[in-house]
């Protein structure tokens, strides 16, 4: 999946299996990524687990779990708030669009989480105070989570180089160079560009991610995934000058 | 005013049960510098607070007492404390600590928010 870190680095990661997205004193978010096509290096998120840790008079420990084709509007115990404590309403799940869009507000830690199902896969977005982001007891282990450190270098796909490459190639050459060797050849570059431009008129990294995803999978749902990811940034990012990220040299992991 | 948070972090960093910075080690000076930094960060919201002024004077006192230089390494807090509370409430029966923005930032600017997102392939 494509990852935008807390420090506004943008990466495309091929991480497979379960990885920690966030792991701090209040919250643990784990994602499971699976290959989008057999033999493909590109992966997308098929499962998401969020653990809200027990916190003082506010919330009991609550677990939220979403999987492909299952985006519940409740915690695994069936509740929609933080439990029986006085401040239970400082943690709330709201269903925005049934089966497609859920928002979790954790007011006790100033945090908003948006989970969506777009096509077969899940997207995740969070707004969190820096103090909560950095509330990590053991930096050696907890500090390794993806939202903070990004993906390990050996798990990154240089999709910007792929994109530059794609502009000068036909679909046949592209499919061979693609991280998804079995990607359909019926999806020309021009079509991918047109589809992405429709939803993402600014040629930023979200637009480029969209093009990459269409060329890699042939699945037009990924256009919507990039579109909603940017919409979530607009809603959740505090710096409106940083909504769009643009091409730059590839980052080393933090 | 977050002065109690600064105090608690300093007490925690320099007290006995966690391999402390004893009062004649470089770690003690580092803990003092961290404490001074913490008090500076909260200064704007602590004007007129006696506990704050007591902390500032106490730091100066200990700095000179232990020959600590103002510059030098600071210590990392051993354990980040939980988001602090002020005296606003989300609703009448909800403890004030359960509303991060209202309670913590009642006296200061809004917190620095960060964003992380994951999507697509």
């Amino acid at each position: 999946p494509h990852l935008r870190t807390f420090t506004d680095r943008f990466q495309t990661c091929k991480v497979q299996g379960a990885w920690p997205l966030i792991d701090n004193n209040y919250l643990n978010v784990q994602v499971t990524n699976t290959p989008v096509l057999p033999g493909s290096a590109a992966t997308a998120t098929s499962k998401l687990t969020i653990i809200f840790k027990n916190f003082q008079e506010c919330v009991d420990q609550k677990v939220y779990q979403a999987e492909m084709d299952e985006l519940p509007a409740a915690f695994v115990d069936g509740s929609k708030n933080g439990g029986d404590k006085h401040g239970a309403n400082s943690l709330k799940i709201t269903e925005k669009v049934s089966g497609q869009h859920v928002e979790i507000q954790a007011k006790y830690i100033g945090t908003t989480i948006v989970v969506r199902q777009v096509g077969r896969y899940l997207t995740f977005a969070v707004r969190m105070p820096e103090e909560v982001v950095n509330a990590v007891e053991d930096w050696d282990s907890q500090g390794l989570y993806l939202c903070l450190r990004g993906c390990p270098l050996n798990q990154q796909i240089d999709f910007q180089a792929f994109h530059t490459n794609a502009e000068g190639t036909g679909a046949r050459r592209l499919a061979a160079a693609s991280p998804a060797p079995t990607a359909p050849e019926t999806f020309p570059y021009e079509t991918a560009v047109a589809k992405c431009k429709e939803k993402l008129p600014v040629e930023d990294l979200y637009y480029q991610a969209c093009v990459f995803d269409l060329l890699t999978t042939g699945d037009v749902n990924f256009t919507l995934a990039a579109y909603y990811a940017l919409e979530d940034v607009k809603m959740l990012h505090s710096n409106k000058d940083k909504l769009h990220l643009y091409e730059r040299t590839r980052d080393l992991p933090g | 005013c977050k002065i109690l948070k600064c105090n608690s972090e300093f007490w925690s960093a320099t007290s006995g049960s966690h391999a402390p910075a004893s009062d004649d080690t470089p770690e003690f000076c580092a803990a003092l510098r961290s404490y001074a930094l913490c008090t500076r960060r909260t200064a704007r919201t602590c004007r007129g607070d006696l506990a704050y002024h007591s902390a500032v004077h106490g730091i100066e006192d200990l700095m000179s007492q232990h020959n600590c230089s103002k510059d030098g390494p600071t210590s990392q807090p051993r354990l980040r404390t939980l988001p602090p509370a002020g005296d606003s409430q989300e609703r009448s029966d909800s403890p004030e600590i359960c509303h991060y923005e209202k309670s913590f930032h009642k006296h200061s600017a809004t917190p620095n928010y960060t964003h992380c997102g994951l999507f697509g392939d």
Partner: antibody, heavy 120, light 109 residues
Framework: EVQLVQSGAEVKKPGASVKVSCKAS????????ISWVRQAPGQGLDWMGW????????NYAQKLQGRVTMTTDTSTSTAYMELSSLRSEDTAVYYC?????????????WGQGTLVTVSS | QSALTQPRSVSGSPGQSVTISCTGT?????????VSWYQQHPGKAPKLMLY???KRPSGVPDRFSGSKSGNTASLTISGLQAEDEADYYC?????????FGGGTKVTVL
């Protein structure tokens, strides 16, 4: 004037719970911790724990863990100490004390004490 | 059994000096700036007399002084007066615990 005023004496049966209040005035409540200390008849002082009214963080004496709960209400500048599963050896005067300011940890202002008698 | 050890009692005549010791470990006393002393008269709440080993809060007479040597902190009352007859407790903050001494009864003969 800085003051801590505690609730009145209580008589409780074994197994019951007691909740003692401690109302602070004359200072910024969230800038000082509150410690709770008890003293059995004819005995020394026994530290029970402390709470930060600022963050809600608590630190309880190990031997009371699971039985003691300390809370604060910053809207009324009041600290509370609740002790459950009372036994006869919990009969004591319970004091709240303000934790001093600045780099030094000490208890500079004390409540008048609340006598809790546990008797069947 | 208290974590900090104090003598059960000490006594002196008016005008004399008495010293109360408070012995702990290196972490609870030896390396700590968190040793304080409290006076308690019968039926009353304790009163802070010294903090940070040697510092006197305002309102405490200067005949009360503190010192520390190794893992032992001491409170000295010089020029003992009748109103100094009381129990005295030392405490030390040791991170996850606040440690009290068992208390020392000071008697003015």
């Amino acid at each position: 004037e800085v003051q801590l005023v505690q609730s009145g004496a209580e008589v409780k049966k074994p197994g019951a719970s007691v909740k003692v209040s401690c109302k602070a005035s004359g200072y910024t409540f969230t800038s000082h911790g509150i410690s709770w200390v008890r003293q059995a008849p004819g005995q020394g002082l026994d530290w029970m724990g402390w709470i930060s009214p600022y963050s809600g963080n608590t630190n309880y004496a190990q031997k009371l863990q699971g039985r003691v709960t300390m809370t604060t209400d910053t809207s009324t500048s009041t600290a509370y100490m609740e002790l459950s599963s009372l036994r006869s050896e919990d009969t004591a005067v319970y004091y709240c004390a303000r934790v001093g300011s600045g780099p030094y940890y000490y208890m500079d202002v004390w409540g008048q004490g609340t006598l809790v008698t546990v008797s069947s | 059994q208290s974590a900090l050890t104090q003598p059960r009692s000490v006594s002196g005549s008016p005008g004399q000096s008495v010293t109360i010791s408070c012995t702990g470990t290196s972490s609870s006393v030896g390396d700590s700036i968190y040793v304080s002393w409290y006076q308690q008269h019968p039926g009353k709440a304790p009163k802070l007399m010294l903090y940070d080993v040697t510092k006197r809060p305002s309102g405490v007479p200067d005949r009360f002084s503190g010192s520390k040597s190794g893992n032992t902190a001491s409170l000295t009352i010089s020029g003992l007066q009748a109103e100094d007859e009381a129990d005295y407790y030392c405490i030390s903050y040791a991170g996850t615990d606040t440690l009290f001494g068992g208390g020392t009864k000071v008697t003015v003969l």
